[in-house]
Interface confidence: low
């Protein structure tokens, strides 16, 4: 439905508060280095303009597209060239090329200072002094650090952030009330950002078809009682929502997401029995709840898949008539029967089925050719099952920290060219799969583990894409979205790698390590571990364990010493010498 003024349409649909918040997110995700005050000024100008268009849709410039309006506004930033370099060249382009140019310059790892949490009293004072600015600053800081964060979901996080401060700043023990809530929001926020980053990568690198296939599989698992036509409609709508958000069209995305939630709740009888509670919530909570809703029960009387997809004489006829819909129906039917499979496994099975039909439907006897296609699925199913079993056993034996260390060593040996901070971040996250998924019963382990690993490996892929250093990473990241994890799993030690020169400075530590949190201290030790492996890629597990145990003892000893700095200097030299001897450096 065409509107005379798109900006007026979205302002009216979303309301002023959400409109301003979403424009701020959009601007912060594009111009990640701009100061907060500059963004607020731009947002206020856009909002005032939108109000004039609401009053009179025929007013000057009100008929312009949102990309034109927002792009023009971003290009008024005076310091664009000094701050962003070649990104300023985007402003010489016309829409839609200009927006594409801005999108290409989004930085997954912007050079921004770590967010340091002030004292609770300081935060509460700031919250009470100016609640609106305080919450805007939250949106701004998250959006600029996570340029693909799912904007309507960030509004939900901001609502929870506000609720936490409203409740806790008047509590007797503010810190005890607030800090766990902020920790939870931080962890959930990072997870949400990473999940959305995978959706955007899927759309941008592998296309709409890949995203739709993912969505068919996931929604069919979640809504196994819904008809294929219903799932198809939801997939089409969901694809539109995510295409918009990943493309920077945040107002349209938020509006369409609200419409989708409304449709789902109006039609929950034919979608899922699990939606009732979600649909009673206010909009932001409702959309979040629907996105996280548990799988509905599978219909009891589902017939065998073989009848329609193997035994039927019409398989090739049906496939030829409408390939993607027939494959979509296969994926729908398989996924609704298998909530115990990961989405990526289901997509591998569908790909195998497609490849078999492509080959067999051109053969002399198609049915004879594809009759055993389901047998080809067995090894594909067993591979992740075995991998998860082995790794969960290792996790249970080692605990999270040491399991992370095992993965650090494993991945550093596979791709030693990758930067140490990236290897530490990715391996730590890979290691979290243990505590996240191994506690689940068998039937829930694979969807939890393998789909989580897809999200984490995508972090590696997007960080590596910014500064490519390893052909092996590029290959695993670009060849197949659904085979990324098996591709990385299959990598052996990189025999072509020339070990890094030994640098004592890398292994020099100071007393400041003693005041770090347990997490930060772990990161320091894990950074040292990666560097050790880069120096000595052929070091055995036993050698590395011995050095790391010595290192842990060294840190503990010096942190208890009266003269910590001297201890670190003197004992550190001894440790380096002992480590060199132990590893033959």
């Amino acid at each position: 439905d065409a509107h005379k003024s798109e900006v007026a349409h979205r302002f009216k649909d979303l309301g002023e508060e959400n409109f301003k918040a979403l424009v701020l997110i959009a601007f912060a995700q594009y111009l990640q280095q701009c100061p907060f005050e500059d963004h607020v000024k731009l947002v206020n100008e856009v909002t005032e303009f939108a109000k004039t268009c609401v009053a009179d849709e025929s007013a000057e410039n009100c008929d312009k597209s949102l990309h034109t309006l927002f792009g023009d506004k971003l290009c008024t930033v005076a310091t664009l060239r000094e701050t962003y370099g070649e990104m300023a060249d985007c402003c010489a382009k016309q829409e839609p090329e200009r927006n594409e140019c801005f999108l290409q310059h989004k930085d997954d790892n912007p050079n921004l200072p770590r967010l340091v949490r002030p004292e609770v009293d300081v935060m509460c004072t700031a919250f009470h002094d100016n609640e609106e600015t305080f919450l805007k600053k939250y949106l701004y800081e998250i959006a600029r650090r996570h340029p693909y964060f799912y904007a309507p979901e960030l509004l939900f996080f901001a609502k929870r952030y506000k609720a936490a401060f409203t409740e806790c700043c008047q509590a007797a023990d503010k810190a005890a009330c607030l800090l766990p809530k902020l920790d939870e929001l931080r962890d959930e926020g990072k997870a949400s950002s990473a999940k959305q980053r995978l959706k955007c990568a899927s759309l941008q690198k592998f296309g709409e078809r890949a995203f739709k296939a993912w969505a068919v599989a996931r929604l069919s698992q979640r809504f196994p009682k819904a008809e294929f036509a219903e799932v198809s409609k939801l997939v089409t709508d969901l694809t539109k929502v995510h295409t918009e958000c990943c493309h920077g069209d945040l107002l349209e995305c938020a509006d369409d997401r609200a419409d989708l939630a409304k449709y789902i709740c109006e039609n929950q009888d034919s979608i899922s029995s699990k939606l009732k509670e979600c649909c009673e919530k206010p909009l932001l909570e409702k959309s979040h709840c629907i996105a996280e809703v548990e799988n509905d029960e599978m219909p009891a009387d589902l017939p065998s898949l073989a009848a329609d997809f193997v035994e039927s004489k019409d398989v090739c006829k049906n496939y030829a008539e409408a390939k993607d819909v027939f494959l979509g129906m296969f994926l729908y039917e398989y996924a609704r029967r298998h909530p115990d499979y990961s989405v990526v496994l289901l997509l591998r099975l569908a790909k195998t089925y497609e490849t078999t039909l492509e080959k067999c439907c051109a053969a002399a006897d198609p049915h004879e050719c594809y009759a055993k296609v389901f047998d080809e699925f067995k090894p594909l199913v067993e591979e992740p099952q075995n991998l998860i079993k082995q790794n969960c056993e290792l996790f249970e034996q080692l605990g999270e920290y040491k399991f992370q260390n095992a993965l650090l060593v494993r991945y550093t040996k596979k791709v030693p060219q990758v930067s140490t901070p990236t290897l530490v971040e990715v391996s730590r996250n890979l290691g979290k799969v243990g505590s996240k998924c191994c506690k689940h019963p068998e039937a829930k382990r694979m969807p939890c583990a393998e789909d989580y690993l897809s999200v984490v490996l995508n972090q590696l892929c997007v960080l590596h894409e910014k500064t490519p250093v390893s052909d092996r990473v590029t290959k695993c990241c670009t060849e197949s979205l659904v085979n990324r994890r098996p591709c990385f799993s299959a990598l052996e030690v990189d025999e072509t790698y020339v070990p890094k020169e030994f640098n004592a400075e890398t292994f020099t530590f100071h007393a400041d390590i003693c005041t770090l949190s347990e997490k930060e201290r772990q990161i320091k030790k894990q950074t040292a571990l990666v560097e050790l492996v880069k120096h000595k890629p052929k070091a055995t597990k036993e050698q590395l364990k011995a050095v790391m145990d010595d290192f842990a003892a060294f840190v503990e000893k010096c942190c208890k010493a009266d003269d910590k700095e001297t201890c670190f200097a003197e004992e550190g030299k001894k440790l380096v010498a002992a480590s060199q001897a132990a590893l033959g450096l």
Partner: nanobody, 115 residues
Framework: EVQLLESGGGLVQPGGSLRLSCAAS????????MSWVRQAPGKGPEWVSA????????RYAETVKGRFTISRDNSKNTLYLQMNSLRPEDTAVYYC????????GSQGTLVTVSS
């Protein structure tokens, strides 16, 4: 993309007749059973009738048996519902779906039976 487009609805007097059509595209129409479903104002969806992929096997809800006839033309990718002896309680939005379900994958066509 699966698309189902209904037409043929309208205002009709009690006892009158209407023929609804559903044009299907984006999937192998001849391979799937189809249904008609209706939703009266303020009520939930109600399954009306179903037909198998070849058109040989047809089923009807008790409320419409003997008055409605479902049929299909696979060469035209079209599903039909012939509605005779219409009653005020037949007033609803009618829509077609793939398989035998009450899920809405389309906009539907409004049938109003009133004198």
């Amino acid at each position: 993309e699966v698309q189902l487009l209904e037409s043929g609805g309208g205002l009709v007097q009690p006892g009158g007749s209407l023929r609804l059509s559903c044009a299907a595209s984006g999937f192998s129409f001849g391979s799937f059973g189809m249904s008609w479903v209706r939703q009266a104002p303020g009520k939930g969806p109600e399954w009306v009738s179903a037909i198998d992929s070849g058109g040989a096997d047809t089923r009807y809800a008790e409320t419409v048996k003997g008055r409605f006839t479902i049929s299909r033309d696979n060469s035209k990718n079209t599903l039909y519902l012939q509605m005779n002896s219409l009653r005020p309680e037949d007033t609803a939005v009618y829509y077609c779906t793939i398989g035998r379900s009450t899920s809405r994958g389309s906009q539907g066509t409004l049938v109003t039976v009133s004198s």
